[in-house]
């Protein structure tokens, strides 16, 4: 650590005195203090001499000697008072800038330590300090306003009592800056805009910040717009608003609009798109397939996306048949607005019944006209099977009828013994019928197919089973010949309740 001679913490001299401050260190040393012309400096290796042969009140201050090469950064300091009876203050600054809640040091250095008891801080023109101004004084450094507030941005003077009268320093302007957390907050409304050519439009760009020093502008396709700015202050924030009013929009007004605000912390921007159209429009679409298949008893939500300008004047869901004249319950229809010009309409169909298959249409209207989007809903059913014994063209024939949706496939099994259902161990023969005869196939209904198995002689200790399956499930019917005739068995487990 460097050493200063004289080795005293402070030195008091009269104006005109000779002052010599010598600093010695291990390596090269340098002096630091308030810049002043009233010194001469002589450096010689590891020592440096700061001297004046005509000290003035302006030499009052703290002088620090440091050793730049010292990794520990040690320093020594001495405070010099030049006590000028006419000049109680040496003011080191015209202005002090701090952030809110920082301590603000107003550097009025007292030139005579004896005057410390009679010092005070005032605002210029003798005005008292604002209430709640908490300050302290150090003869070496000046007045400190603790946790300075924005409202304390004022011009201050330091006052000392000399021979019964107050002597003021030159003034110091304190600027307390608000702590700016980031770039200004922005709003640009609307977020999206559509207008028909010739209509009026308004776009509002506004920015706010705790500090008044920020800029805001609105640009259209990268061209800055010259718009008068409205300024306001409320909720402890400064607000700047730019309003673009267009009486009759045309296609050249369309495009991207950006609201941009900047301050010392950086820049924020937000954008919106303005569409100008020739006439009203109404577009219906769905992300779903318009042809829907759902298993009976399950639920389905039908969703339609609507894009429209101007807004909708009416809309509804309609059931177009074919089963009944019932209409969807209003409580099952739901509308959500994604944004100003886009909406989603949902029809919920829970636990679908056979009579609810068919066409569902969403209709919407605006000044551009009517539009409709129709869904076709087909219900899927597992197969239902029945077998009868009959003679066709004199031949004994087992006739299997299966109905379900999608169209069932049919397989015949012959197995030993009497059983409700053939299992693998019992199976004697298997016949697949790749092309059963379609008896009925109407839209939104089950498909009924018929398969024939010609049997020359019925084996009495055997079972004939017709199995049908589709993507939903399977059904079967066992036929057991008995001496007195034929006996048929639907499987016990088969129970269908939609």
């Amino acid at each position: 650590i460097p050493v200063i001679e004289p080795s005293v913490p402070e030195l008091v001299v009269k104006p005109g005195a000779t002052v010599t401050l010598r600093c010695v260190g291990n390596g090269s040393v340098e002096w630091d203090g308030p810049p002043s012309p009233h010194w001469t400096l002589y450096s010689d290796g590891s020592s440096s001499i700061l001297s004046t042969n005509n000290a003035t009140f302006q030499n009052t201050g703290t002088y620090r000697c440091t050793e730049p090469g010292d990794p520990l950064g040690g320093s020594a300091a001495i405070h010099l008072y030049v006590k000028d009876p006419a000049r109680p203050w040496n003011v080191l600054a015209q202005e002090v800038v701090v952030f809110e809640d920082q301590d603000a040091l107003l550097p009025c250095l007292l030139t005579d330590p004896v005057l410390e008891a009679g010092v005070s801080l005032v605002r210029v023109r003798g005005r008292p300090l604002m209430r709640h101004t908490n300050y302290s004084f150090s003869p070496w450094h000046g007045f400190t306003i603790h946790r300075a507030k924005f409202i304390q941005s004022q011009d201050y003077q330091c006052s000392a009592l000399m021979g019964g009268r107050k002597v003021m320093s030159i003034s110091i302007r304190l600027k307390v800056q608000k702590v700016i957390p980031g770039p200004p907050a922005l709003t640009l409304v609307p977020a999206e805009l559509v207008r028909i050519r010739g209509e009026a439009a308004q776009i509002v760009c506004s920015a706010s910040s705790v500090d008044v020093n920020f800029d805001v502008f609105l640009q259209h396709n990268n061209t800055k717009l010259a718009i008068p700015q409205q300024s306001d202050f409320h909720n402890n924030r400064y607000q700047k608003v730019l309003t673009l009013n267009l009486d009759q929009v045309d296609f050249q007004h369309a495009g991207n609009y950006s609201c941009v605000a900047s301050n010392v912390q950086g820049k924020h921007s937000t954008s919106m798109f303005f569409r100008v159209v020739e006439s009203a429009y109404l577009n219906l679409s769905s992300e779903q397939n318009l042809i829907q298949e759902v298993t009976v008893g399950e639920g389905l939500n039908l969703k339609v996306m609507v894009e429209a300008y101007p807004g909708l004047q009416g809309f509804n869901w309609t059931y177009l048949g074919p089963f009944s004249d019932h209409q969807p319950e209003p409580k099952l229809a739901n509308a959500t607005t994604k944004d100003t010009y886009r909406h989603t309409f949902t029809l919920s169909l829970p636990r679908l019944k056979p009579s609810e298959a068919g066409r569902y249409s969403f209709l919407a209207r605006n000044p551009g006209g009517w539009r409709a989007l129709t869904f076709e809903l087909t219900l899927r059913y597992p197969p239902e099977v029945s077998v009868i014994w009959t003679f066709i063209n004199g031949s004994g024939t087992l006739l299997c009828a299966a109905s379900g949706y999608p169209q069932p496939n049919v397989t015949w099994l012959q197995c030993s013994g009497h059983t409700d259902r053939c299992d693998e161990a019992q199976v004697l023969q298997v016949w697949d019928d790749p092309y059963p005869e379609v008896l009925s196939q109407e839209p939104f209904h089950k498909v009924t197919v018929q398969s024939l198995l010609t049997v020359e002689t019925l084996e009495h200790n055997q079972t004939y089973e017709c199995r049908a399956h589709n993507s939903v499930g399977s059904g079967s019917w066992a036929f057991i010949p008995i001496s007195a005739g034929a006996h048929t068995h639907p499987p016990d487990e088969f129970l269908f309740t939609p």
Partner: antibody
Framework: QVQLQESGPGLVKPSETLSLTCTVS????????WSWIRQPAGKGLEWIGR???????KYNPSLKSRVAMSVDTSKNQFSLKLSSVTAADTAVYYC???????????WGQGTLVTVSS | QSVLTQPPSASGTPGQRVTISCSGS????????VTWYQQLPGTAPKLLIY???QRPSGVPDRFSGSKSGTSASLAISGLQSEDEADYYC???????????FGGGTKLTVL
Amino acid sequence: QVQLQESGPGLVKPSETLSLTCTVSGGSISSYYWSWIRQPAGKGLEWIGRIYTSGSIKYNPSLKSRVAMSVDTSKNQFSLKLSSVTAADTAVYYCAREGILGYFDYWGQGTLVTVSS
Amino acid sequence: QSVLTQPPSASGTPGQRVTISCSGSSSNIGSNTVTWYQQLPGTAPKLLIYSNNQRPSGVPDRFSGSKSGTSASLAISGLQSEDEADYYCAAWDDSLSGPVFGGGTKLTVL
């Protein structure tokens, strides 16, 4: 070794505000006085003002109404703002450390700021 | 217009002695010490002389300064080609509470 580096936009439009930052490295910004000096092309040097780490500032009276300085000790930086600029403010702007006798012992390399529309 | 006055140019041949003058007023050079800076082309100024005649470490003793009344001068002896630069005088100005500068002298080594 103390080093100073100026940064900021090289082009400013008339009537706007010129903003520059000086970053100090190789030493602490604390306990020293830091100045801004400018030099118009082919002309002499002009002292703009100085700032101390406590926020104490002295400005050149000829520029005082348009100048603002600030210091950020946590970033080892100090800043200059010059408002309502005109073409006459086009210059190389230097930041420098001001020694106890009022001379400048460490300088930044300078940054050219042009005021033009 | 600079506060301190310097000749715009000066020249000399290698090995020669060249002097650059700087004049001011009682509020600057008359009552305060003078500093000289050297600015090589395309670089920042560099401290050359302070307190009228003191050289920082690393500055050759070919450079010397003096002051008399409200004027000061910089002398360069044994002129070398690397001395070709702009030279600025500066002094504290009491009315400014800060430094003022001369307009600079362009030294050409012929």
